[in-house]
């Protein structure tokens, strides 16, 4: 589809005569009839196969024709066609005299013709005007013409239909030859396929609009190149979706069991030494002068009971002071002013002279201690039992009652039921107060993970069209990661083709 345009520029009829030679009265009121038809070697009368057009009276005798296209007028003259432009044509231009206002052919006398020109030739579609001038004995006509395509038609013959669009069916404008030119961010034959964010993973990502990167199940990140680990995975990573490979120092199905608390949290203060003592458990060994679970508190100097012989300790700004009982003196009440003659030994203790009677020493019976056997032995005061063990006085001796999981004279040894690796099939072992517990990986159960309870959901190759299959550990089901161009729970349907059902 296109338009043959004819621009009349100047008509000269100096003598103001008709083709018959008769003069027009009072002058030749001139209008034109145009006939456009298929190419004829010799242009002959007959149907104007490509179209006809008439002008109103444009002037008298000789005149220039004004370009009226901008004002919606009739110059250039428009001869539209709705077929492929053949590249050749025949053109007949007749100049007529209009004695009255009725310009219809049947209303004009036959001798009202002023002149007639006929041309033929080839003409390519294009924006450039061809200028021509035809002269007869009495008249001269200057004009130009061209063929252009209608809106939305392109190509050498105006045969290519192309309408720019920006919707679900395409995102493009049209090139001069009618080919589609995709808008930025779109590609494909009809510019329907968005160009995803640069770097978006080909298999794991997709997009529904340009510069987007939407991730397929099991993938995450700006470019969908990071796998999603198993739900609940705390201190682990993955190389394929739904994995949970533990970082160093962590264990368990979800890598949430802290096997190296000391390194991860540095809980011990004031230069104390930290020891890992099980999952999320640690022990701080304090430097002298510090106490508390984390050695976070200083010890009061009196806490070490520095005063001897029954002296009482008082904390002071710059340390401590011992208040000595009668008969004793010195920084720690360590010196006695008594002798055996004073019977200083209590609770049946026997007195022995020292330094020629200037001093003495008490030998205490069992269960009593102190310089004067004045203290009943409480063998638990030093809290010798480790790991929460309970200290029990048993006459002259003591014993530690250990919490479950600990043994040794002072409960200093940790009994690990897990040491012999009792959990089968990669199960994670947990020490409990009264035994152990196995956390089994997916597919296994039983007290020691010895029972296989499920099979690999991907073993039957349920995914089509070269899709990747992943086993979801939490539900024992599979997930198909479809390649581009396929959808469906098993990637069985090509994109754009609805599934055909037998009913």
């Amino acid at each position: 589809s296109g338009v043959f345009q004819l621009q009349l520029q100047e008509f000269i009829n100096e003598r103001g005569v008709l083709a018959s030679g008769r003069p027009c009265e009072p002058g030749c009121r001139t209008f034109f009839r145009v006939c456009l038809k298929h190419f004829q070697a010799v242009v002959s009368p007959g149907p104007c196969t490509f179209g006809t057009v008439s002008t109103p009276v444009l002037g008298t005798n000789s005149f220039a024709v004004r370009d009226d296209s901008s004002g919606g007028g009739r110059n250039p003259l428009q001869l539209p066609f709705n077929f492929t432009w053949p590249g050749t044509f025949s053109l007949i231009i007749e100049a007529w005299h209009a004695p009255g206002d009725d310009l219809r052919p049947e209303a004009l006398p036959p001798d009202a013709l002023i002149s007639k020109i006929a041309i033929q030739g080839s003409l390519a579609v294009g924006q450039n005007w061809l200028l021509d001038e035809q002269t007869s004995t009495l008249t001269r006509l200057r004009y130009s013409y061209r063929v252009i395509c209608s809106d939305n038609y392109y190509g050498d013959n105006c045969s290519r239909l192309c309408k720019k669009r920006n919707d679900h069916f395409g995102h493009y404008v049209c090139q001069p030859d009618g080919n589609l030119s995709c808008l930025p961010g779109w590609t494909g034959e009809y510019c329907q396929q968005p160009i995803c964010l640069s770097g978006c993973h080909e298999q794991n990502g997709y997009c529904s609009k340009p510069a987007e990167c939407l991730c397929r199940p099991g993938w995450q990140g700006r470019l969908c190149n990071e796998c999603i680990p198993h739900n609940g995975c705390r201190h682990g990573t993955c190389s394929t979706p739904w994995q949970c490979t533990c970082d160093e120092g962590w264990g368990g199905l979800f890598c949430d069991q802290d096997l190296n608390y000391c390194t991860h949290h540095s809980p011990c203060k004031n230069g104390a030494t930290c020891s890992n003592s099980g999952q999320r458990s640690y022990t701080c060994t304090c430097r002298p002068g510090y106490t508390g679970v984390d050695c976070e508190l200083e010890l009061s100097e009196c806490d070490s009971n520095p005063c001897r012989n029954g002296g009482s300790c008082k904390d002071q700004e710059d340390g401590y002071h011992c208040l000595c009982p009668p008969g004793y003196y010195g920084l720690h009440c360590e010196h006695s002013t008594l002798s055996c003659a004073d019977s200083p030994c209590f609770n049946g203790g026997s007195c022995r002279e020292r330094n020629q009677g200037a001093n003495y020493a008490c030998e205490c019976p069992p269960n009593f201690t102190g310089s004067n056997c004045e203290k009943k032995v409480d063998r638990c005061t030093s809290n010798p039992c480790a790991n929460g063990g309970q200290c029990l006085n048993r006459g002259p001796s003591r014993m530690c009652r250990c919490r479950p999981g600990f043994t040794g004279t002072y409960c200093e040894l940790h009994v690990s039921d897990c040491a012999r690796n009792p959990c089968a099939h990669g199960g994670t072992c947990h020490d409990l107060e009264n035994g152990l517990m196995c956390t089994c990986p997916a597919g296994f159960s039983g007290r020691r993970c010895e029972v296989r309870t499920s099979i690999d959901a991907c073993a039957s190759s349920p995914c089509f069209n070269r899709a990747t299959c992943y086993t979801d550990l939490s539900t024992d089901t599979f997930v198909c990661n479809c390649p581009y161009g396929f959808v469906g729970s098993r990637c069985e349907f090509p994109v754009g083709l609805p599934p055909s059902f037998p009913w």
Epitope: E296, L299, S300
Partner: antibody, heavy 119, light 108 residues
């Protein structure tokens, strides 16, 4: 925000064991940072620090009460508890549970519960 | 243990006045590990100052703490009606953690 709530009997007979529980809401008792602490206030008197427990179950007690006091934790219930055995009238007090940060400043307290030791 | 002695036992002042509360330790408090608390009748104590001088988030700037070693001070620059109640100091450098016997701040 984290809140603490003490619970337990308001009256205990002499020589028996006083038992209180502190429930932590709005946060996890499993946090590495905190010392979960018991403090008491005798009627009309000052405050006395009893001791603390950490998430791991490790405890530390005021030496003046050691031997009579046990603090335990139940992480599954987000609770920690206090037991004082062989109580006397001198143990009558308002008991508070509190959260201490890495240094022992008590930024969050329960509203307190009055325990009377009387026959 | 480290004994904390607070003075005065009772302080009677009017709103708008300046209050100065003292806390003296029986032995030096390392790292200025001293805190101040406010307690109203029937309520739990509320932490005001830690580290001798660091005001806790949400505490008005009329409260300030100072001191080191054995002598510490809590100052309330301009008393508001809601500031009256008991004030306790606490040391947390040494075992056992101890509190002062308290200063009662009452309306004159």
């Amino acid at each position: 925000q984290v809140q603490l709530q003490e619970s337990g009997p308001g009256l205990v007979k002499p020589s028996q064991t006083l038992s209180l529980t502190c429930t932590v809401s709005g946060g996890s008792i499993n946090s590495v940072t905190y010392y979960w602490t018991w403090i008491r206030q005798h009627p009309g008197r000052g405050l006395e620090w009893i001791g603390y427990i950490k998430f791991s179950g490790s405890t530390y007690y005021n030496p003046s009460l050691k031997g009579r006091v046990t603090i335990s934790v139940d992480t599954s219930k987000n609770q920690f508890s206090l037991k004082i055995n062989s109580v006397t009238a001198a143990d009558t007090a308002v008991f508070y549970c509190a959260r201490a940060s890495g240094s022992h400043t008590f930024d969050i307290w329960g509203q307190g519960t009055m325990v009377t030791v009387s026959s | 243990e480290t004994t904390l002695t607070q003075s005065p036992g009772t302080l009677s002042l009017s709103p708008g006045e300046r209050a100065t509360l003292s806390c003296r330790a029986s032995q030096s408090v390392s790292n200025s590990y001293l805190a101040w608390y406010q307690q109203k009748p029937g309520q739990a104590p509320r932490l005001l100052i830690s580290g001798a001088s660091s005001r806790v988030t949400g505490i008005p700037d009329r409260f300030s703490g100072s001191g080191s070693g054995t002598d510490f001070t809590l100052t309330i620059s301009r008393l508001e009606p809601e500031d009256f109640g008991m004030y306790y100091c606490q040391q947390y450098s040494r075992s056992p953690i101890t509190f002062g016997q308290g200063t009662k701040l009452e309306i004159k």
